[in-house]
C-alpha cells in the first residue's frame, strides 16, 4: 500500500496478486534516499489504482523488464513518427522551392 509521507518510505505493504503488463498504466521506481533506504516500486494500474510492488520478487523483476521494453519501443515509434514528419516537411519545402524556380 503506497503512502507518501515525509521522512519515511512510501510502501508499507506490497501487492499480493500478479500484475499483468496489459493492466499497467505507469511504473515508477524510486532509488534509495535519506528518507527511505530501499528501492520502492509503485505501479499505477489502468483503473487508477496505485499499488506497491516487491522489488525482490522474480515476477516483479520480469514485469519491470517487460515494461521498460514496452516504453523503449513506444519511444522508438514516437521518434520514428517525428522523423517521418520532418521528412514530409523537407519534401514540402523542396517542392515549394522548385515551384518558385519554375515560375
Amino acid at each position: 500500500t503506497p503512502v507518501v509521507r515525509k521522512g519515511r518510505c512510501s510502501c508499507i505493504s506490497t501487492n499480493q496478486g500478479t500484475i499483468h503488463l496489459q493492466s499497467l498504466k505507469d511504473l515508477k521506481q524510486f532509488a534509495p534516499s535519506p528518507s527511505c533506504e530501499k528501492i520502492e516500486i509503485i505501479a499505477t494500474l489502468k483503473n487508477g489504482v496505485q499499488t506497491c510492488l516487491n522489488p525482490d520478487s522474480a515476477d516483479v523483476k520480469e514485469l519491470i523488464k517487460k515494461w521498460e521494453k514496452q516504453v523503449s519501443q513506444k519511444k522508438k515509434q514516437k521518434n520514428g513518427k517525428k522523423h517521418q514528419k520532418k521528412k514530409v516537411l523537407k519534401v514540402r519545402k523542396s517542392q515549394r522551392s522548385r515551384q518558385k524556380k519554375t515560375t
Epitope: 521522512g7 519515511r8 508499507i12 505493504s13 499480493q16 530501499k38 499499488t51
Partner: antibody, heavy 121, light 109 residues
C-alpha cells in the same frame, strides 16, 4: 483461511519485560505491513507500532517509543512485540493487524483475537 | 500529530433508523487515508470503510462513508440488530502515529 493469532500475554510486574507473538497464516505474510494496536480496559483503540513488509522500517506511537520494539520473521510468518520497562498504563488487550496490501488505500483488514497484558505489582 | 474527534459519543437509535456518525480531524487528512472500523464487545475491530468512502470486502451496502479534508461521515442507512456496536475512525494521512478517534457507541433506544 486468513488468520492472525496472538500469544504471549499475561500478568507482569511494572518495570519487567514481555514479548508478544502473532502467527500469520492464509496469506503471503512477507508482502504485508503489520501493526500492533492496543485497547485498555473500557477504552478506545490506540495504534502502537507498524513494521513494513520487509522489516526494514519501523514506526512507533510516542507512548511506547524507546520501550517497545516491533520485529518480524518472514520465514516463520510471525510478528513480534518486545515490551520493556512495562508500566501500569500498558495494561491492555494487544491486537496484531494486517495492513491491507491490495491498493492505494490503507486500512487494517485482518485482526487477531487479541492477547491480554496486565501490568500489576 | 493529527487528533480525531468523533461525535456524538453515544447514539441511541432503533433498528431500521438511519445513523450518521461524524469524525473531525484537527488538520486536513487526505481522503485516501481515512478508515472506519466497527467493534462489538469482546471482539476485535472490523474494517468497514477505507479511503473515506470505499467499502471493505463483505461489508453490506447499508454502510457508506463520505467526506474530505477535516470532516468525514459514516452513514448506516437502516440499522440492523447486528449494527449496534462502537465505531472508530482512523487516519493514515500523516507521519505516524496513525491515530484513532475516541469512538461512537451506537446503542439500542
Amino acid at each position: 483461511q486468513v488468520q492472525l493469532v496472538e500469544s504471549g500475554g499475561g500478568v507482569v510486574q511494572p518495570g519487567r519485560s514481555l514479548r508478544l507473538s502473532c502467527a500469520a497464516s492464509g496469506f503471503t505474510f512477507s508482502n504485508c505491513g503489520m501493526h500492533w494496536v492496543r485497547q485498555a480496559p473500557g477504552k478506545g483503540l490506540e495504534w502502537v507500532a507498524l513494521i513494513g513488509y520487509d522489516g526494514i522500517n519501523e514506526y512507533y506511537a510516542d507512548s511506547v517509543k524507546g520501550r517497545f520494539t516491533i520485529s518480524r520473521d518472514n520465514s516463520k510468518n510471525t510478528l513480534y512485540l518486545q515490551m520493556n520497562s512495562l508500566r501500569a498504563e500498558d495494561t491492555a488487550v494487544f491486537y496484531c493487524a494486517r495492513d491491507w496490501p491490495e491498493g492505494y488505500y490503507n486500512g487494517m483488514d485482518v485482526w487477531g483475537q487479541g492477547t491480554t497484558v496486565t501490568v500489576s505489582s | 500529530e493529527i487528533v480525531l474527534t468523533q461525535s456524538p459519543g453515544t447514539l441511541s437509535l432503533s433498528p431500521g433508523e438511519r445513523a450518521t456518525l461524524s469524525c473531525r480531524a484537527s488538520q486536513s487528512v487526505s481522503s485516501s487515508y481515512l478508515a472506519w472500523y466497527q467493534q462489538k464487545p469482546g471482539q476485535a475491530p472490523r474494517l468497514l470503510i477505507y479511503g473515506a468512502s470505499s467499502r471493505a470486502t463483505g461489508i453490506p451496502d447499508r454502510f457508506s462513508g463520505s467526506g474530505s479534508g477535516t470532516d468525514f461521515t459514516l452513514t448506516i442507512s437502516r440499522l440492523e440488530p447486528e449494527d449496534f456496536a462502537v465505531y472508530y475512525c482512523q487516519q493514515y494521512g500523516s507521519s505516524p502515529p496513525f491515530t484513532f478517534g475516541p469512538g461512537t457507541k451506537v446503542d439500542i433506544k
